[in-house]
């Protein structure tokens, strides 16, 4: 038995039959000894006397709230709730299983940016006696805060003969940092309490994979002279992180007809404008996604094909314009080759992704993950690596992706990724271990030392232990090549002398 | 399942036109937009155009645009491609093909040799 | 117009060892890209469009990565079927072009 709140208490049931329960003493909250009785919920019928009562627990008719008095007069109360555990698993009653992106996921979460700020929802087909209760934490052994609104009833549905209701809550890091590189996951607990059932669900994620924008806003079209042609042109969402030289994002632009099954013409570019087809009684649609980092793709922004008659052209906000200052990456050298490294940097994007298709869709944080990759660097919130750090002084930035890229391509070139199963040499791994030299290079070339961070000795014996750590290895890397592409973009557009 | 049947080959003087057909079968004849693409003996891919049936609607490569005219009679599911003042570097296997996607090409015809001889 | 340039023009590669293709477009194209495979007297198949995705009924050995202006096609393990020439193609704006091709051939 444990403390849910004050006056309100779970017991822990293994759930068979004729299981025998749980002993549980409840004590009455007075200074008073004698003349004490006990009920429970409404009834009158007393339970027993005296300041403690001792109940075996057993099924939910023991559950409820027990009421101590003294002469009429109601002294405190305890709320017992239960907590079923069957075959060794806690149940899951209340809510619903959204089965995406798996099975037995309880509770979905988006960010429409890298604020810190994320949305959780879940589904129960159950409309009264129900509560919520939403904790959330950056990290589990020393956790961050994070700070949870009250879950409210966000939608309602109905499904076939049932009604669904959707509930959703907001929470917000308390120190967000959205440059950085995340470490630790953020993680959410949701009590749901039905009648006198208690359950709890947990969500782990990082917010860069929760990440889903809003929508391109503002589609504008204008058509080409003596061409089928059409111009569309759209802005960023106004609620993506900013500056978007910086936090980039890639489109997908498509024309199709009312069905899905009709023909399209469909171009992926990284512009806030693009030229394509529009036939009658189409429409053009464009979508949204984090350019460096495979999160989801926004819902889709529409505007219909006819009646393309906008005065204006593409007005892109991709950018935030202006030739920085010319600075100094390395102590007496000069910038790094901006654009290079923002062309090798979006390469090592793709490559760390197509380096194993299923990394993007394993969920490899288990037990003891968070040791398990603390030991590779992270680019911190103190690194310098955000629009201002780069601003004030590029180099500490440069410098530990510097050491980063030199961290991974050794990684990569270890015996984890040489061992059993084979890679070969031009394999995505392979060629992923030569552009991160290639880049290191590009940013520490001959005569410049920067100190490396020591490779840790991580070597397993067992080929399914070496996947199992290329893939978390790898799902590290496209976390780390995502900021690195960033720095490098904006550094491209902003610091390029 | 989607199948394109081209005409057959053809033989032309310079300064003469070719007129080659396409045949289509399996699926709806408006759904799919139809491409037309050329390669000379040896030599590499080349777009040439596309049009919608559904509607007529053309798009030729600037290299080909006064020269080509692409045109489909819904009637019998066909797409003709007609070359006019022909030249000995117009000599190539001609493809047309079919997509719902307007920019890649899914489904092929078997080609059509066209040779320009004097 | 985008330029392709397919690297190598010709490839040789023993059967079961693998194959990559490299093309490279004059300007970013995103991931507009797509691969085809051609045998002598045989029309162009699609393998890869947009960059990576993959086609049903094409064997899982053949792969497709890149974006941006570098572009690569991995022939995991080449099969005797295999052998033929491949052709990229660009499809960010018309008119839409094909890379020169690579003839992958018995070593």
């Known amino acids: 038995i444990w403390e849910l709140k004050k006056d309100v208490y779970v017991v822990e049931l293994d759930w068979y039959p004729d299981a025998p329960g749980e002993m549980v003493v409840l004590t009455c909250d007075t200074p008073e000894e004698d003349g004490i009785t006990w009920t429970l919920d409404q009834s009158s019928e007393v339970l027993g006397s005296g300041k403690t009562l001792t109940i075996q627990v057993k099924e939910f008719g023991d559950a409820g709230q027990y009421t101590c008095h003294k002469g009429g007069e109601v002294l405190s109360h305890s709320l017992l709730l239960l907590h079923k555990k069957e075959d060794g698993i806690w149940s899951t009653d209340i809510l619903k299983d959204q089965k995406e992106p798996k099975n037995k996921t309880f509770l979905r979460c988006e960010a429409k940016n890298y604020s810190g700020r994320f949305t959780c929802w879940w589904l129960t087909t159950i409309s009264t006696d129900l509560t919520f209760s939403v904790k959330s934490s950056r990290g589990s052994s020393d956790p961050q805060g994070v700070t949870c609104g009250a879950a409210t009833l966000s939608a309602e549905r109905v499904r076939g003969d049932n009604k669904e209701y959707e509930y959703s809550v907001e929470c917000q890091e308390d120190s967000a940092c959205p440059a950085a590189e995340e470490s630790l996951p953020i993680e959410v607990m949701v009590d749901a309490v039905h009648k006198l059932k208690y359950e709890n669900y947990t969500s782990s994620f990082f917010i860069r994979d929760i990440i889903k924008p809003d929508p391109p806003k503002n589609l504008q079209l204008k058509p080409l002279k003596n061409s089928r042609q059409v111009e569309v042109s759209w802005e960023y969402p106004d609620t993506w992180s900013t500056p978007h030289s910086y936090f980039s994002l890639t489109f997908c632009v498509q024309v199709q007809g009312k069905s899905k099954r009709e023909k399209k013409d469909r171009v992926f570019t990284a512009k806030t404008s693009a030229t394509v087809i529009c036939r009658k009684n189409a429409s053009i649609s464009v979508r949204a996604q984090d350019r460096y980092y495979s999160s989801s793709w926004s819902e889709w922004a529409s505007v219909p094909c006819s009646g393309s008659g906008s005065s204006r052209g593409g007005s892109g906000s991709g950018g935030s314009g202006g030739g920085g200052s010319k600075l100094r990456a390395v102590p007496g050298g000069s910038s790094p080759a901006w654009t290079q490294c923002q062309q090798l940097s979006q390469k090592l994007c793709t490559l760390a992704w197509s380096a194993h298709p299923l990394v993007g869709h394993m969920d490899l944080r288990e037990e003891g993950d968070e040791e398990t990759t603390n030991d590779v660097p992270h680019i911190q919130c103190g690194d310098g690596c955000d629009p201002q750090g780069l601003r004030d002084n590029s180099q500490f930035c440069l410098q530990r992706i510097h050491q980063g890229l030199i961290f991974y391509e050794k990684l990569l070139g270890s015996d984890i990724f040489t061992g059993e199963p084979s890679l070969l040499p031009d394999s995505p791994v392979g060629q992923l271990h030569a552009s991160l030299l290639g880049l290191s290079q590009l940013l520490q070339p001959e005569g410049h030392h920067w100190e490396t961070q020591q490779i840790p000795s991580l070597s397993p014996s067992q080929p399914w232990q070496r996947l199992l750590l290329r893939f978390k290895i790898l799902r590290s890397l496209q976390a780390f090549v995502a900021v690195a592409a960033r720095v490098f973009a904006h550094g491209a557009a902003t610091l390029s002398p | 399942q989607v199948q394109l049947v081209q005409s057959g080959a053809e033989v032309k003087k310079p300064g003469a036109s070719v007129k080659v057909s396409c045949k289509a079968s399996?699926?709806?004849?408006?759904?799919?937009?139809l491409h037309w693409v050329r390669q000379a003996p040896g030599q590499g891919l080349e777009w040439m155009g596309w049009i919608d049936p559904e509607n007529g609607d053309t798009e030729y490569a600037p290299k080909f645009q006064g020269r080509v005219t692409m045109t489909t009679d819904t009637s019998t599911s066909t797409a003709y491609m007609e070359l006019r003042s022909l030249r000995s570097d117009d000599t190539a296997v001609y493809y047309c093909?079919?997509?719902?996607?307007?920019?890649?090409?899914?489904?092929w015809g078997q080609g059509t040799m066209v040779t320009v001889s004097s | 117009e985008i330029v392709m340039t397919q690297s190598p023009a010709t490839l040789s590669v023993s059967p079961g060892e693998r194959a990559t293709l490299s093309c490279r477009a004059s300007q970013s194209i995103s991931i507009n890209l797509h691969w085809y495979q051609q045998k002598p007297g045989q029309a162009p198949r699609l393998l890869i469009y947009f960059a990576s995705q993959s086609i049903s009924g094409i064997p899982a050995r053949f792969s497709g990565s890149g974006s941006g202006t570098e572009f690569t096609l991995t022939i995991s393990s080449l099969q005797s079927e295999d052998f033929a020439v491949y052709y990229c193609q660009q499809s960010n704006s018309f008119p839409l072009t094909f890379g020169g091709g690579t003839k992958v051939e018995i070593k």
């Open positions: 399996g699926y709806t004849f408006t759904d799919y937009y």
């Open positions: 093909n079919a997509n719902k996607e307007l920019r890649y090409f899914d489904v």
